[in-house]
């Protein structure tokens, strides 16, 4: 024959355990009923009546099966340089993110405690790195034959143009500016952006003079996220 | 003019520990990353890593990130690679160079060969 | 890990065009992945070509582009030179670290 099915309240065989969504109440000794998410314990169970539960009121949530006699307290709204990317219900917390230009400084369990606006990198330095949701954006300075004209937390180091003819031989910060006759670029026509979110960093010392004879040049990307310095304005 | 200068060839035996420096001359070490990568033999090109000798911030491939160890010395403008638990497979080239996505600052070691053999 | 894959060798007549292809595992290549192509030659250090997707690195000849073509990175390669036959790695940006490709072995033939 089957076993038979045990209404809560009920009292658990020796050494088993409640089962699913249920727990064991210490006082009554007894396997009772949780509350489903959105709802908390308003009445706890006895040896003959299971636990009532009850709605979470505005402003309270609880996210998991529970006990609790009171639904836990949504976090505060978010603030100015933040987003809401999850609002309060009865099931869960409300979720502050970082807008867009600026990344998270410290953390929380969900969501950011703290948002800091992106790095600029001044001209003369480029984007090293690029900024996430959680890392500030890294400057480094132009190398030789390349510049950055801008204050930018996406704007990274590109090639001068190649002249003909150099009107004004180009350096850290300016392009090449070529004589009327038409330059060949070394690159695409229009700046290279990187994607938001992302600030900037450190970048000091002059870049070296050109060496002699013009670098093989290559690129990887750039790295981890660190406090500014002189090549990098606030927002 | 820019040169980095790397160790001298190693031979070692599976589950010790290697460590290769990469000298650099002719401009400011902390003004460009360092990466590490690696050519098995007959084989491509694999990142290893990255580190920042400004402030000594590191970046390393999923694969390497528990193995593998960067730092630098600017007091000597030298960067250090140490790979641990090495195996047969790691036999490769071991280049460091500035090489980055958008510095355009382009320089490689003359790269340093390690041998893991039993 | 992503995995990164190239042609594994392509051959090009003198004078003529070819295009290398990068393709991500992870899905179409974008700006955000910033393509990087670099050229090894036997015995010779290796360089860099592009940066960026698209920008050419100085003192790179013209008759070498970079583009983005249907969700893969790609090197285009016009009026090849017997000089340009070398192998290519592309390498592609993933949030916090490079992948390179296996490597296109390019001849001039």
């Known amino acids: 024959l089957p076993a038979q099915v045990a209404f809560t309240p009920y009292a658990p065989e020796p050494g088993s355990t409640c089962r699913l969504r249920e727990y064991y109440d210490q006082t009554a000794q007894m396997c009772c009923s949780k509350c489903s998410p959105g709802q908390h314990a308003k009445v706890f169970c006895t040896k003959t009546s299971d636990t009532v539960c009850d709605s979470c009121e505005d402003s309270t949530y609880t996210q998991l099966w529970n006990w609790v006699p009171e639904c836990l307290s949504c976090g505060s709204r978010c603030s100015s340089d933040q987003v809401e990317t999850q609002a309060c219900t009865r099931e869960q917390n409300r979720i502050c993110t970082c807008r867009p230009g600026w990344y998270c400084a410290l953390s929380k369990q969900e969501g950011c405690r703290l948002c800091a606006p992106l790095r600029k990198c001044r001209p003369g330095f480029g984007v090293a790195r690029p900024g996430t949701e959680t890392s500030d954006v890294v400057c480094k300075p132009c190398a030789p034959g390349t510049f950055s004209n801008t204050t930018s937390s996406t704007d990274i180091c590109r090639p001068h143009q190649i002249c003909n003819v150099v009107a004004i031989p180009g350096n850290a910060s300016m392009d090449a500016v070529c004589t009327s006759t038409s330059p060949t670029r070394s690159m695409a026509p229009g700046a290279v952006h990187l994607p938001q979110p992302v600030s900037t960093r450190s970048q000091h010392t002059q870049p070296t003079p050109e060496p002699s004879t013009a670098p093989s040049t290559s690129f990887l990307l750039p790295m981890g996220p660190s406090p500014p310095a002189e090549g990098s304005t606030g927002d | 003019q820019v040169q980095l200068v790397q160790s001298g060839a190693e031979v070692k035996k599976p589950g010790a520990s290697v460590k290769v420096s990469c000298k650099a001359s002719?401009?400011?070490?902390?003004?460009?990353?360092i990466h590490w990568v690696r050519q098995a033999p007959g084989q491509g090109l694999e990142w290893i890593g990255r580190?920042?000798?400004?402030?000594?911030?590191?970046e390393y491939a999923p694969n390497f990130q528990d193995r593998a160890t960067m730092t630098t010395d600017t007091s000597t403008s030298t960067a250090y690679l140490e790979l641990s638990s090495l195996r047969s497979e790691d036999t490769a080239v071991y280049y460091c160079?500035?090489?980055?996505?958008?510095?355009?600052?382009?320089?490689w070691g003359q790269g340093t060969t390690v041998t893991v053999s039993s | 890990q992503a995995v990164v894959t190239q042609e594994p060798s392509l051959t090009v007549s003198p004078g003529g065009t070819v295009t290398l292809t990068c393709r991500s595992s992870?899905?179409?290549?974008?700006?955000?992945?910033?393509a990087n192509w670099v050229q090894q030659k036997p015995g010779q250090a290796f360089r860099g070509l592009i940066g960026?997707?698209?920008d050419r690195a100085p003192g790179v000849p013209a008759r070498f582009s970079g583009s983005l073509l249907g969700g893969k990175a790609a090197l285009t390669l016009s009026g090849a030179q017997p000089e340009d036959e070398a192998e290519y790695y592309c390498?592609?940006?993933?949030?916090?670290?490079?992948?390179f490709g296996g490597g296109t072995k390019l001849t001039v033939l």
């Open positions: 160079s500035t090489w980055d996505g958008f510095s355009y600052f382009d320089y």
């Open positions: 002719g401009y400011t070490i902390t003004d460009f990353y």
């Open positions: 580190v920042d000798p400004e402030d000594g911030n590191t």
């Open positions: 992870t899905g179409p290549v974008t700006t955000n992945n910033y």
């Open positions: 960026g997707t698209n």
């Open positions: 390498a592609l940006w993933y949030r916090n670290h490079w992948v």
